[in-house]
Amino acid sequence: LTCLGGFASPGPVPPSTALRELIEELVNITQNQKAPLCNGSMVWSINLTAGMYCAALESLINVSGCSAIEKTQRMLSGFCPHKVSAGQFSSLHVRDTKIEVAQFVKDLLLHLKKLFREGQFN
């Protein structure tokens, strides 16, 4: 987690700040959801354990043309140490069921809130 702030940032963003911003973005998505998120697109669910950020990105990056999650995709890339491209699934990412993006975001949000409360920022 080096420089999540981008070029305009005065320095590296603390992990706690980065996680809080990701949580805020997911909250924003769930609260502003009127029509079905990403037209009801379905993505692979993930195990919310080790490698979660990369797995989440690997799943969501396959959804294109959905502006509502573009910022989330960018933010997740800052948490993942390797480059992720569409169609790429690591050995950690077991593909066993697909769920709607809206449910994926809700599940991820609940887990990230738990991590934040417990002080697990990396």
Partner: nanobody
Framework: EVQLLESGGGLVQPGGSLRLSCAAS????????MDWVRQAPGKGREWVST????????WYADSVKGRFTISRDNSKNTLYLQMNGLRAEDTAVYYC?????????WGQGTLVTVSS
């Protein structure tokens, strides 16, 4: 323009079989992962199965594993779902979908009713 046209649904008795087809056009079919998704009356959308672009890899929801088989014929731009051992809880409208695109590209679906 992406078009998906499902067919093959109907009324079948419990334990019976049906084969659904989906004719695809408007995109490079053999490059796309494809899904079958269903929606039971008054319920939300449920993922059923996915097949890789080549057809070599397949995935199934636990509820249909061992009973349903997804396949594709890339030379005919067609996706299939062979449904055996049908149960009342399989009653739904079945849609084929270009993976990750949502229902903006779904067809009209095909109704499967399992009843004695």
């Amino acid at each position: 323009e992406v078009q998906l046209l499902e067919s093959g649904g109907g009324l079948v008795q419990p334990g019976g079989s049906l084969r659904l087809s989906c004719a695809a056009s408007g995109f490079t079919f053999d490059r796309e992962e494809m899904d079958w998704v269903r929606q039971a009356p008054g319920k939300g959308r449920e993922w059923v199965s996915t097949i890789s672009p080549s057809g070599r890899k397949t995935w199934y929801a636990d509820s249909v594993k061992g009973r349903f088989t997804i396949s594709r014929d890339n030379s005919k731009n067609t996706l299939y779902l062979q449904m055996n051992g049908l149960r009342a809880e399989d009653t739904a409208v079945y849609y084929c979908a270009k993976a990750y695109t949502g229902f903006r590209y779904w067809g009209q679906g095909t109704l499967v009713t399992v009843s004695s």
